[in-house]
């Protein structure tokens, strides 16, 4: 995929944005108690653009497209307490904890990757 | 898919813009002369988002892209002149004529419907 | 008691997919209370985590292999089933299905495990 | 190379106790439960601990789990010919997003 697109000399004035924002995350399970963490989520503005296709093609589509995800996490365990359950009193979710976000090309998997 | 999304309770001074920017387009065919056409390319910055994601997952996975394509779009035909082939002299390509764009969802194939 | 067994092609070449299902008996794959897990050995050597999933269909990848796994559940036949792609010798190794007690790192019952050699 | 690090072998007496250790970091054991596994010759593992100290109903309580910082700790008392295996501990690590396992530890009782 083609790197990313900062800025557009036919728009110069204006610059993709892609924000790693603090959220409250709610994290619950059937028959548990939902536990509230800090967590982050990704938000913004990229950059894409569709130039007019031929057929047959001259040359490679030219579609563009970037979108805000997220560009470093880690998956932690956290644990719910399940006092109505004698079988399973606890229960292990796993939560994906946003480090930092960026504008990446549209189709690709968001990047999971450890510190 | 869910509806595009053109403004943000968190950046109410940010909007969502996707622009049809007039263009000059070469057509072009191995052998026989370009012509230049007038048309339409689609640019812009729609908004996305990814919010955290959990397994077992409580709900869908919430992540949101729009990306800047046409929302409009007939495909005409250019002749093009192939003075050097005796056989086939002249070629017929199909070009894509973009009349309006819009903030679409990112999976989506752009709308090539006539007007 | 649960039991799981491991069912599938002893011997998958080069380049092609791997595919092996867990059967499970004596308990329900739908009753919300477990996450089902494939882990591998190595010959000779430690253990590794490939993933798990839930009834629902949720599904989560050991990152490091995510890129050629898939796990998938048919709660019609109390089966889940692994798909590992473009395997190489060093995907031979003792494939085990397991169940843990919706606790992620705890694996209370094992499938006796299977040999899956990677060899053209 | 394994994340966590255990001894490859130890070796005791019968009646004498053994003690396994398994060393991490903070993104793994530093802030995540422990199970232990004993994998005898020829069969799958099989849950010895759990939550660093937990054992499952029909594990005797000559088997002993503990964590202190990065580190947990498998003991086994009044060894028997049968516990001759491999050991394993487990835990999540959340740098790398995914479950891991030591190296294992044989044990001999001698």
């Known amino acids: 995929a083609p790197p990313p697109i900062n800025k557009l000399a036919l728009f110069p004035d204006k610059s993709a944005w892609c924000e790693a924002k603090n959220i409250t995350q709610i994290v619950g399970h059937s028959g548990c108690e939902a536990k509230s963490i800090q967590n982050r989520a990704c938000l913004g503005q990229c950059f894409s653009y569709s130039v007019p296709n031929t057929f047959p093609q001259s040359t490679e589509s030219l579609v563009h497209c970037d979108s805000c995800m997220p560009a470093q996490s880690m998956w932690e365990i956290v644990t719910l307490e399940c006092p109505g359950h004698e079988e399973v009193p606890r229960v292990d979710k796993l939560v994906e904890k946003i480090v930092h976000c960026s504008c990446q090309a549209c189709g690709k998997e968001p990047s999971h990757e450890g510190l | 898919a869910p509806p595009p999304i053109n403004k943000l309770a968190l950046f109410p001074d940010k909007s969502a813009w996707c622009e049809a920017k007039n263009i000059t387009q070469i057509v072009g065919h191995s052998g026989c002369e370009a012509k230049s056409i007038q048309n339409r390319a689609c640019l812009g910055q729609c908004f996305s988002y990814s919010v955290p994601n959990t397994f077992p997952q409580s709900t869908e996975s919430l992540v949101h892209c729009d990306s800047c394509m046409p929302a409009q779009s007939m495909w005409e035909i250019v002749t093009l002149e192939c003075p050097g082939h005796e056989e086939v002299p002249r070629v017929d390509k199909l070009v894509e004529k973009i009349v309006h764009c819009s903030c679409q969802a990112c999976g989506k194939e752009p709308s090539h419907e006539g007007l | 008691e649960v039991q799981l067994l491991e069912s599938g092609p002893g011997l998958v070449k080069p380049s092609q997919t791997l595919s092996l299902t867990c059967t499970v008996s004596g308990g329900s794959i739908s009753s919300g209370g477990y996450y089902w897990s494939w882990i591998r050995q190595h010959p000779g050597k430690g253990l590794e985590w490939i993933g798990y999933?839930?009834?629902?269909?949720?599904?989560y990848y050991n990152p490091s292999l995510k890129s050629r796994v898939t796990i998938s559940v048919d709660t019609s036949k109390n089966q889940f089933s692994l798909k590992l792609s473009s395997v190489t010798a060093a995907d031979t190794a003792v494939y085990y299905c397991a169940r843990t007690n919706s606790r992620i790192t705890m694996i209370a019952d094992w499938g006796q495990g299977t040999l899956v050699t990677v060899s053209s | 190379q394994s994340v966590l690090t255990q001894p490859p072998s130890v070796s005791a007496a019968p009646g004498q106790k053994v003690t396994i250790s398994c060393s991490g970091s903070s993104s793994n054991i530093g802030n995540n439960y422990v199970s232990w596994y004993q994998q005898l010759p020829g069969t799958a593992p099989k849950l010895l601990i759990y939550?660093?100290?937990k054992r499952p109903s029909g594990i005797p309580d000559r088997f002993s789990g503990s964590k202190s910082g990065t580190s947990a700790t498998l003991g086994i008392t009044g060894l028997q010919t049968g516990d001759e295996a491999d050991y394993y501990c487990g835990t999540w690590d959340s740098s790398l997003s995914a479950g891991v396992f030591g190296g294992g530890t044989q044990l001999t009782v001698l």
């Open positions: 999933i839930y009834y629902s269909g949720s599904t």
């Open positions: 939550d660093n100290n």
